[in-house]
Interface confidence: low
């Protein structure tokens, strides 16, 4: 008799892949646009890279550290009016993106949250809540919340608002935080929040390091459900070697929980390569024609349009990883079980129940390392296999598809691979 | 197709200003990156500076207290001053419009006018 | 500013034969872009992004490169190949050009 199926868990969109944030609309589109009706024109390239959801703005109007002059219920008009905003949100929904607004209220000024009048604001928060549910958003982000005095009571406040509306409805919280034990008194207090924070900002240095990191998260916030980023708002590539990029992107996408990535992430877009740009908002590269200022200094293999002709690409990799981490049970909601590798490696398994199931196995170092996976740290219920299938390699020239013996198995520097077994009972 | 033709006097005093127009046809100067360049007698090019489909200009550092670009859009001309000339500014005068588009490369010139500096 | 040196400054060769010419950077650049003029004509763009060839340039030039060190190469020289190539950058400005190679028929 077939051993009975596991019961699903109850699964929320943001489970299902990715979030995608664009916080300057302006440097997002470039080319002196950045409005909501020339953002709608993007969405079919949110959608070839198969994220859940949208994190936009803020784009209410702010005066600088003005909160007479700071509405959370208008748009900026330099962004476009609410029917653009209108707009914009039916095209996403056609689309199967949700969009979630940035609501963070001095987002031009000084102290996000007008330190002096923190009441005033939790006040116009909460009326602006009420009214964008009712406008068809999908949920909400607030940043910078540890310059919000008692943020634990006003978020949870806020997501009674939002749950209340329904629970469907997500909100997002973002803190410069790295601190595990401030992390997790914010998480205590607010149930089905997501919170992004710099927790995994300083994860660059080793596979040993990043492991102790991930599984002391996992292991502090037990089964709630978590979000990867390396910061609230910036780029990989501020915290990253160019070289431990792909390594991320299938670490982020692979760790059971949501991946939040800021627009540029997948293809590597990196303000210090674009001079003059804002290291927070750099222009995103397109094509060539993007960064005009300094002519040659864009390459296309920096660019969209050049890296979607070539398969090999970091954006190629990214729509990959989002393609799978959306579609296959063990990636969406899948048991996680860390184990040793060996020095400079981070190895994990994924699995649910009779699905098949993926090995990850990355390579910090820079150098070459034959990997010593101990099974024995693994449960009976995750044990590996002789040999597993490469799914895919965060470096050219492997044969994709192809049986790989687990005790033989060695990586190139900064490699990244997933790899396929199915279960066996 | 693009074309781009340089006017202006062939012949100007030292200290005085040399002024040249690019006449441009076949595109806007509303897009894209309008240069000058100047070839001296011995052959080297220089890079004298631009103005921008925005109307920004860069001026070569070597040449920035003299040099100035404009531009009438309703003309679809731009402009060349170049101040306080000596003998040493005598070349031929390019404009030019390069357009560098993911594997494309265009540079389209005009034909260039020898400017003599002279008393 | 970035400082192109081309060389050499003239040379001439006969038909058939290979001709290289050299162009070195002062920095690292991404790109070598390539120019030919004749006499009493413009400039001409003849080789992009190092090694493409613009439209209508014969497949014997061909050009290669990276960092500071880029060169372009005709591999069999023909009568019509007489006339003087500037390398030029993008990579920052004030864009910079070679001082030319004069390349004569023997």
């Known amino acids: 008799r077939a051993p009975r199926c596991r019961e699903l868990p109850a699964q929320k969109w943001w489970h299902t892949g990715a979030l995608y944030r664009i916080g300057d609309l302006q440097a997002f589109q470039g080319h002196g646009a950045g409005n909501l009706a020339g953002l709608k024109g993007r969405l079919d390239y949110l959608s070839s890279l198969k994220v859940k959801g949208l994190v936009l703005g803020p784009i209410h109007k702010n005066q600088k550290d003005d909160v007479a002059q700071t509405d959370l219920l208008q748009i900026d008009p330099n962004f476009g009016s609410k029917e653009d905003f209108d707009s914009l949100l039916q095209s996403a929904k056609k689309k199967s993106i949700r969009v979630i607004l940035d609501l963070t209220p001095n987002y031009r000024g000084e102290n996000s949250w007008f330190s002096t009048q923190v009441d005033t604001v939790a006040t116009k928060v909460k009326d602006a809540l009420e009214f964008w549910l009712q406008a068809g958003v999908d949920g909400f982000q607030v940043r910078d919340i540890e310059n919000l005095k008692d943020a634990s009571s006003f978020l949870a406040e806020w997501q009674n608002i939002t749950k209340g509306f329904s629970e469907d409805r997500l909100l997002i919280a973002g803190t410069n935080s790295s601190d595990l034990q401030q992390i997790l008194s914010l998480l205590e207090s607010n149930k089905d929040l997501l919170l992004t924070s710099s927790y995994l900002s300083d994860s660059g240095s080793t596979g040993e390091h990043t492991k102790s990191l991930v599984t002391q998260y996992l292991n502090a916030t037990g089964n709630r459900w978590c979000s990867w980023s390396l910061s609230q708002a910036r780029l990989l590539t501020s915290f990253l070697p160019a070289q431990l990029l792909r390594l991320y992107q299938l670490m982020l996408f692979t760790l059971p929980g949501t991946p939040v990535f800021s627009y540029g992430d997948e293809i590597g877009l990196d303000a210090a390569a674009l001079p003059g740009q804002p290291m927070e908002a750099p222009v995103m590269l397109w094509d060539e024609s993007s960064f005009p200022d300094i002519p040659g200094a864009v390459s296309a293999n920096m660019t969209v349009k050049g890296q979607s002709e070539d398969p090999g690409s970091l954006l190629s990799l990214f729509r990959r990883l989002s393609d799978q981490r959306s579609k296959e049970r063990s990636l969406l909601h899948g048991d996680f079980h860390a184990f040793s590798a060996g020095p400079g490696l981070f190895s994990y398994i994924r699995h649910w129940d009779q699905n098949e199931r993926f090995l990850v196995v990355l390579n910090f170092g820079d150098v070459g390392l034959s990997a010593g996976l101990q099974a024995s740290d693994l449960p009976a219920s995750a044990s590996l296999p002789a040999k597993a299938d490469l799914l895919l390699s965060t470096q050219p020239g492997r044969e994709e598809g192809s049986p790989l013996e687990l005790e033989r198995l060695k990586l190139e520097p900064h490699e990244g691979l997933l790899l396929r077994f199915p279960y066996a009972a | 197709e693009v074309q781009l033709q340089e006017s202006g006097p062939s012949l100007v005093k030292p200290s005085q200003t040399l002024s040249l127009t690019c006449s441009v046809t076949g595109d806007s100067i509303t897009s894209g990156y309008w240069n000058w360049i100047r070839k001296f007698p011995g052959n080297k090019l220089e890079y004298m500076g631009y103005?921008?489909?925005?109307?920004?200009?860069y001026y070569n550092p070597s040449l920035k207290s003299r040099v100035s670009i404009t531009r009438d859009t309703s003309k679809n001309q731009y402009y060349l001053q170049l101040n306080s000339v000596t003998t040493e500014d005598t070349a031929t005068y390019y404009c030019?419009?390069?357009?560098?588009?993911?594997?494309?490369?265009?540079?389209?010139w005009g034909q260039g006018t020898l400017v003599t500096v002279s008393a | 500013q970035i400082v192109l040196t081309q060389s050499p400054a003239i040379m001439s060769a006969s038909p058939g034969e290979k001709v290289t010419i050299s162009c070195s950077a002062s920095?690292?650049?991404?790109?070598m872009y390539w120019f030919q003029q004749k006499p009493g004509s413009s400039p001409k763009p003849w080789i992009y992004?190092?090694?493409i060839l613009a439209s209508g340039v014969p497949d014997r030039f061909s050009g290669s490169g990276s960092g500071t060190s880029y060169s372009l190469t005709i591999s069999s020289m023909e009568a019509e190949d007489a006339a003087t190539y500037y390398c030029?950058?993008?990579?920052?400005?004030?864009?910079?050009f070679g001082a030319g190679t004069k390349l004569e028929l023997k």
């Open positions: 030029q950058q993008y990579q920052s400005y004030p864009l910079t």
């Open positions: 030019q419009r390069h357009v560098i588009y993911d594997y494309t490369w265009f540079a389209y």
């Open positions: 103005i921008s489909y925005s109307g920004r200009t």
């Open positions: 920095s690292s650049v991404h790109y």
């Open positions: 992004r190092t090694s």
